[in-house]
Amino acid sequence: LVPHLGDREKRDSVCPQGKYIHPQNNSICCTKCHKGTYLYNDCPGPGQDTDCRECESGSFTASENHLRHCLSCSKCRKEMGQVEISSCTVDRDTVCGCRKNQYRHYWSENLFQCFNCSLCLNGTVHLSCQEKQNTVCTCHAGFFLRENECVSCSNCKKSLECTKLCLPQIENVKGTEDSGTT
């Protein structure tokens, strides 16, 4: 099966790499614009230059192209705790990231939020915090993991998943309650 090609891909595939078919004359292959520039005017004829102009401030193209407009630079999302790692240039979009001792959690493919790495208090670090993953903690005896924090088994209710980990403690609590002290 031949994969379905869009009109633009079909047009481009007829020309050699780095060129595209003139939209008004499919016998002409024009040279694509370099990254950092965009297409202002198609080449007038074979072997003649394509009119490419540099992207204006606040816009970019990251690869060779025949776009009529440059792409708008991304803005880092302050409300998500993001910080600018590198600013936008004509040939590269803004790079956003997180502060030191934070990790990225992706809510969707193109949206991430910065959260503080867990410190594993009342536990030990099983896996260190990474760019896109929180610290993995192993809790000490008498503690269980809840929302990536080690919480005392005294906070474990019978209905929760922690009962297996905290079983001895729960039995002790129950035993204390049952023994009628006067």
Epitope: E79, Q113, N148
Partner: nanobody, 119 residues
Framework: EVQLLESGGGLIQPGGSLRLSCAAS????????MVWVRQAPGKGLEWVSH????????YYADPVKGRFTISRDNSRNTLYLQMNSLRAEDTAVYYC????????????RGQGTLVTVSS
């Protein structure tokens, strides 16, 4: 006690419009970034949109971009989601939530309102 109460859901035909509301109480609404998420039948939670504290910065997930508009009225402690050109794939329970701070889970989320898009 934090309370988030969604309303405005219902059965709507494809191409139709709905406006969801979320009444907030028990916290300083104007200090929080607010979020709409949705859960389609048999699927996980999907981020729909969010709006910063002052209503200046907004975000829309690709499937709803150009069709949905998020807004807020801080004087009324209310969050809105205007949904236009509705499609069958927009069928879901819609929840409003406070943007999490401690980790990737929702400490404060409403009970949800069901939106069904069907002819």
């Amino acid at each position: 006690e934090v309370q988030l109460l969604e309303s405005g859901g219902g059965l709507i035909q494809p191409g139709g419009s709905l406006r969801l509301s979320c009444a907030a109480s028990g916290f300083t609404f104007a200090h929080e970034t607010m979020v709409w998420v949705r859960q389609a039948p048999g699927k996980g939670l999907e981020w729909v949109s969010h709006i910063d504290r002052v209503g200046q910065d907004t975000y829309y997930a690709d499937p709803v971009k150009g069709r949905f508009t998020i807004s807020r009225d801080n004087s009324r402690n209310t969050l809105y989601l205007q949904m236009n050109s509705l499609r069958a794939e927009d069928t879901a329970v819609y929840y409003c939530a406070v943007l999490p701070k401690r980790g990737p889970w929702f400490d404060y989320r409403g009970q949800g309102t069901l939106v069904t898009v069907s002819s």
